[in-house]
Interface confidence: low
């Protein structure tokens, strides 16, 4: 059962796994949620009745029954992990803690004008987990305005003490605010030769990379595949670091793969969700339960529904045994990974999907696209919305994209002459405009946020956010698309599609069925040559065929230019403007979303 509220002056007795230090009970709950085994916790707040060495301790706990005896204790705050909950979870913590010194390894000291600047440095430094900043009121003159960047093995402070006139906080890498580059490539036949900070067992290099991404100290990894010559190292995932943040040496070795932590673009990749099945593979670990199941999919469901289950192995039924049901072994370990991986025994293994909610919803795989044709099918573009105006009569006005459960990203030029958000309606999960009737449910718009530098589409800043009056419940037919990562500026997108209900030619009408067209991106230099009378800025992105024929058109405005990269769809552009529609040597011009990620996050994450 999901319990979100904190229990004041209450301590859970027993079940201790480990003790960490956190600046608040709220953050202790987040740490517990992300820990592979923690189900409950007790935090000790600062209090005159409590020994100061126990202040800010966060004791992570586990229990077979999922609960523990409660004891009254002043200054203790207890609660449950969010693992038991179905709602979206985020590790992003923007809080600033006044008069607290979070202890760690001070590896970087510099002068900063403000705590915000210090936090930005921490966010953009590959090693930084948290920081402490001495304000200009700090008693010691030579330490004033000093920004200390810190890291620890666990990513949490080793101690927290009271210290007047300092402030502390965490890196905002998990808030998608880092400018660090993401190197997404996995390098085959490569070993990175640097310090190993940890090692785990993994079924493939992708899972190894995800483990590295959420491990606080891992900057890059090497994975030894099941064909690796040394048997004892097969399926071994080595988590690595270096002073420089990059591997010092690349060694050519067959049957090994290496890659990088994607911590700074983790909002647009699955990190916790290992959804694949591994055939003829057995995961070893502590056995939680053995239950009968009809299939490996059913076994995965059982594991996902058992809060303590981390991974499973399913052994199919021997002919006509047990009503055709196989054995489903539900398992766990201290770190969430199998203790050993064996091949050739006929088992089918996989991981719990319970942790998928710790990833951004936008990373969830959607149903495969229908290749060919121009009409879309239901659920193919679940982030696409149709924005209607009700004045003077109801009609489709523009497209838009779901980017959060209360947010639509669209184009600013759509709102020319729109006096009030009250006349707007957002319909999601729609394939055909004819589905929209009087009683069709819609989202009202609470607020229209237009970029304050917007003047006209052709001069840029053609971007707007709609804040919905109610939240979107994500389903297969309505879910968000990922924003591109700032660290991903060098990604070359090759699988890009424009969608909308707009005209199919310049003089036409709004289409009934959502249309799609695969369109290649065009360099800004090439695009500038085609639009000599305009300035194509880096905040714009162009797409189109040299010969024309496929393009966005009137009515598609505000809709997405969606590009698929590493199985995840990214909102690369917003349909903005162009000369005519699908004309030869006249590419469509789109708002370059990556250039507005900070603006989007500032507006959508504002308190």
């Amino acid at each position: 059962e999901c319990v979100t509220q904190l229990l004041k002056d209450t301590c859970f007795e027993g079940g201790d796994i480990t003790t960490v230090f956190t600046p608040s009970a709220k953050y202790c709950q987040v740490v517990c949620t992300y820990h592979p085994r923690c189900l409950l916790f007790t935090f000790t707040a600062e209090s005159p009745s409590e020994d100061p060495t126990r202040w800010f301790t966060c004791v992570l706990k586990d229990s077979v029954t999922e609960t523990l005896p409660r004891v009254n204790r002043t200054a203790a705050i207890s609660g449950y992990s969010f693992k038991q909950c179905s709602h979206q979870i985020s590790a992003c913590n923007k809080d600033i803690y006044v008069d607290l010194d979070m202890k760690g390894i001070n590896y970087n000291s510099s002068v900063a004008k403000s705590a915000q600047e210090c936090q930005e440095r921490c966010t953009d430094d590959v090693h930084c987990h948290f920081f402490t900043y001495a304000t200009r009121q700090f008693p010691s003159l030579e330490h004033r305005n000093i920004c200390l960047l810190k890291h620890t093995q666990t990513g949490t402070p080793t101690r927290i003490t009271k210290l007047d006139k300092v402030v502390s906080g965490f890196s905002l890498k998990s808030c998608a605010l880092s400018n660090l580059a993401c190197i997404r490539d996995i390098f085959p036949n490569t070993v990175f030769a640097d310090s190993n900070i940890d090692s785990v067992m993994a079924p493939d290099a992708f899972v190894c990379g995800r483990i590295c991404t959420h491990h606080p100290g891992c900057l890059f990894f090497t994975f030894f595949s099941q064909e690796w010559p040394k048997e004892s190292q097969r399926n071994l995932c080595l988590l690595k670091t270096s002073e420089s943040g990059l591997p010092s040496t690349r060694i050519k070795k067959s049957k090994a793969l290496s890659g990088f932590s994607l911590q700074s673009c983790r909002h647009s990749i699955p990190v916790f969700c290992h959804s694949s099945f591994y055939h003829d593979t057995d995961f070893l670990g502590e056995e939680l339960d053995i239950v009968a199941a009809k299939s490996h999919e059913a076994c995965q469901k059982l594991c996902t529904n058992a809060v303590r289950c981390q991974f499973f192995t399913y052994t199919p039924a021997q002919a006509s045994c047990n009503e055709g049901k196989g054995k489903c072994y539900l398992k766990l370990s201290s770190n969430g990974s199998p203790t050993k991986i064996l091949h050739g025994r006929g088992g089918i293994s996989g991981y719990t999907l319970r942790l998928c909610k710790m990833d951004n919803e936008c990373t969830t795989k959607i149903k495969p696209r229908i290749v060919g044709g121009t009409a879309s099918v239901r659920g193919e573009w679940p982030w696409q919305v149709t924005l209607h105006t009700t004045s003077p009569t109801q009609r489709h006005l523009c497209g838009g994209s779901i980017i959060g459960n209360q947010w639509i990203l669209t184009a600013a030029h759509c709102f020319y002459g729109v006096e009030s958000p009250k006349i707007l309606r957002v319909y999601s999960g729609i394939l055909n405009q004819s589905e929209i009737k009087e009683d069709t449910s819609f989202f009202g718009v609470q607020e229209i946020i237009i970029h304050d530098q917007y003047k006209m589409a052709e001069s840029g800043y053609d971007i707007a956010l709609l804040k919905l009056e109610t939240t979107v419940n994500y389903t297969d037919s309505q879910r968000p698309i990922c924003l591109p990562s700032k660290g991903d500026r060098n990604v070359i997108y090759t699988d890009c599609w424009v969608t909308g209900w707009g005209y199919r030619k310049l003089r036409d009408k709004i289409q009934n069925t959502l249309q799609k067209a695969k369109i290649p991106l065009v360099t800004n230099e090439e695009c500038q040559k085609r639009y000599r009378g305009h300035k194509i800025t880096h905040k714009m992105i162009c797409a189109g065929y040299r010969e024309g024929g496929k393009d966005a058109c009137k009515g598609d405005s505000g809709g997405p230019l969606s590009c698929k990269h590493n199985e995840v769809w990214h909102l690369v552009g917003i349909t903005s403007w162009g000369e005519g529609c699908a004309q030869r040597e006249r590419p469509g011009v789109y708002t370059n979303v990556v250039e507005y990620v900070d603006w989007i996050l500032e507006k959508t994450q504002a308190v």
């Epitope: 001070n106 590896y107 970087n108 000291s109 510099s110 440095r121 953009d124 430094d125 590959v126 960047l149 270096s242 002073e243 420089s244 943040g245 990059l246 010092s248």
Partner: nanobody, 122 residues
Framework: QVQLVESGGGSVQAGGSLRLSCAAS????????MAWFRQAPGKGLEGVSL????????SYTDSVKGRFTISQDNSKNTLYLQMNSLKPEDTAVYYC???????????????WGQGTLVTVSS
């Protein structure tokens, strides 16, 4: 091991400019930070400017802000200190240092150059 060799020191009139260079060789990838320190006659070591080699973060001591510029050329493994509007109080032996910590403390730096003398006359 890392070897650091400074050059570019000399004598200059107040208000003049000099550019110091520090060529690094050896196990340079292990250096998280590089720094310029100086030691005036009869005084202790003073941090002048720091640069985080991987992230490019830069910091200056107050007395040189706006006059000195630290930079690096990774392709040549060289650290520079451009010194403009020099003052007599800038007279010192200037040392290049490399280490893993981005810190004003000389103790954080494992590798040091031999030093280059800068004399500023009024």
């Amino acid at each position: 091991q890392v070897q650091l060799v400074e050059s570019g020191g000399g004598s200059v009139q107040a208000g003049g400019s000099l550019r110091l260079s520090c060529a690094a060789s050896g196990y340079t990838y292990s250096m998280g930070a590089m720094a310029w320190f100086r030691q005036a006659p009869g005084k202790g070591l003073e941090g002048v400017s720091l640069i985080a080699t991987s992230s490019g973060f830069i910091s200056y001591t107050d007395s040189v802000k706006g006059r000195f510029t630290i930079s690096q050329d990774n392709s040549k493994n060289t650290l520079y200190l451009q010194m403009n509007s020099l003052k007599p109080e800038d007279t010192a032996v200037y040392y290049c240092a490399a280490g893993t910590q981005f810190s004003w403390s000389p103790g954080s730096y494992n590798y040091w150059g031999q030093g280059t003398l800068v004399t500023v006359s009024s």
